[in-house]
């Protein structure tokens, strides 16, 4: 039975040209995290493998940086970066936990971080 929950940075906003940290945290489970994938729609941004480290997809290498921790830093933001981002935790033996972050990239300097909130797991694959 999957008992874990993923806490994310939730709904966040940032300024065009700036950078933002996407962060997720898996708790309430003793499952071993084997890999974390960061995704946007059907695009794979990055993989953090527990043994092998980070792989940033070549499409994003210029403006995505690994970390901090299992998080991901997006740089040189554009308005086109607005949208949903997902952290996919591959774990053993639980399966897959998914967290969602919505990023809004703003033209002006009114960007501010949304509150953190918890998302219970809602995807499960073996």
């Amino acid at each position: 039975m999957m008992t874990g929950t993923i806490e994310t940075t939730g709904n966040i906003s940032a300024e065009k040209g700036g950078s933002i940290i996407l962060q997720c945290h898996l708790s309430s489970t003793t499952a071993q995290v084997t890999q974390v994938n960061w995704e946007q729609q059907d695009q794979l941004l990055a993989i953090c493998n527990a043994d092998l480290g980070w792989h940033i997809s070549p499409s994003f290498k210029d403006r995505v940086a690994p970390g901090p921790g299992l998080g991901l830093t997006l740089q040189s933001l554009t308005v086109n970066d607005t949208g949903e981002y997902f952290c996919i935790y591959h774990t053993y033996p639980d399966g897959t936990y998914t967290g969602r972050i919505f990023l809004e990239v703003l033209e002006s300097s009114v960007a501010e971080h949304g509150a953190r909130f918890q998302i219970p797991h809602h995807h499960h694959h073996h």
Epitope: T34, Q35, N37, E39, D42, Q43, L44, I47, N49, A50, D51, L52, G53, W54, H55, S57, P58, S59, H90, H125
Partner: antibody, heavy 120, light 107 residues
Framework: EVQLQESGPGLVKPSETLSLTCAVS????????WNWIRQPPGKKLEWMGY???????YYNPSLKSRITISRDTSKNQFSLKLSSVTAADTAVYYC??????????????WGQGTTVTVSS | DIVMTQSPDSLAVSLGERATINCKAS??????VAWYQQKPGQSPKLMIY???YRYTGVPDRFSGSGSGTDFTLTISSLQAEDVAVYYC?????????FGGGTKVEIK
């Protein structure tokens, strides 16, 4: 240039342990990921597992109870042991390097492969 | 495990013509797909990674496309040296898995 060379017996009896070694030249096995991949006759390539730059291992769950991958950094080589073999383990066995940082799980260097037959 | 299914099993194409190989994943693997070429008696060679990026030294007549579950390897103008078996592989999650291969021959 990275070169990998498999060695080991070409014939193994059923229920015994298959042992292969991969000698690596032109690159240190304390970097990147070092893999074993096999191809049974007329079947798909099957990724068996890896040993990482730090010595951590990951095994395909289908083989987990039978497989061991180890390394000897002083000789710059890594090894495969597969226990309790059956005819289904007859295959060409490849050792391979994977540069995860640049190519993810895509394998960029392969050995030439060695054929292992399981038969009494 | 994620199953990678290739089609067709074999393909005969005239020299200079286009060859198209398909690969379907049993679940969404985003762009975590590689393609390999294996000539008779040789080990596989990496051709494409991250679905569409050519590996070092791969001729530009080879291209990869797709995301999600459907992927394609295209040889825009088949050359005699392209006769081989081509395999797709997913590395979205372990265990990394391969397709069954597509044999490309000269018509």
């Amino acid at each position: 240039e990275v070169q990998l060379q498999e060695s080991g017996p070409g014939l193994v009896k059923p229920s015994e342990t298959l042992s292969l070694t991969c000698a690596v030249s032109g690159y240190s096995i304390t970097s990147d990921s070092w893999n074993w991949i096999r191809q049974p006759p007329g079947k798909k390539l099957e990724w068996m597992g890896y040993i990482s730059y730090s010595g951590n291992t990951y095994y395909n769950p289908s083989l987990k109870s039978r497989i061991t991958i180890s390394r000897d950094t002083s000789k710059n080589q890594f090894s495969l042991k597969l226990s309790s073999v059956t005819a289904a383990d007859t295959a060409v066995y490849y050792c391979a390097r994977l540069d995860f940082s640049n190519y993810g799980g895509a394998v960029d260097y392969w050995g030439q492969g060695t054929t292992v037959t399981v038969s009494s | 495990d994620i199953v990678m299914t290739q089609s067709p099993d074999s393909l005969a194409v005239s020299l200079g013509e286009r060859a198209t190989i398909n690969c379907k994943a049993s679940q969404n693997v985003r762009t975590a797909v590689a393609w390999y070429q294996q000539k008779p008696g040789q080990s596989p060679k990496l051709m494409i990674y991250s679905a569409s990026y050519r590996y070092t030294g791969v001729p530009d007549r080879f291209s990869g496309s797709g995301s999600g579950t459907d992927f394609t390897l295209t040889i825009s103008s088949l050359q005699a040296e392209d006769v081989a078996v081509y395999y797709c592989q997913q590395y979205y999650t372990t265990p990394w898995t391969f397709g069954g291969g597509t044999k490309v021959e000269i018509k």
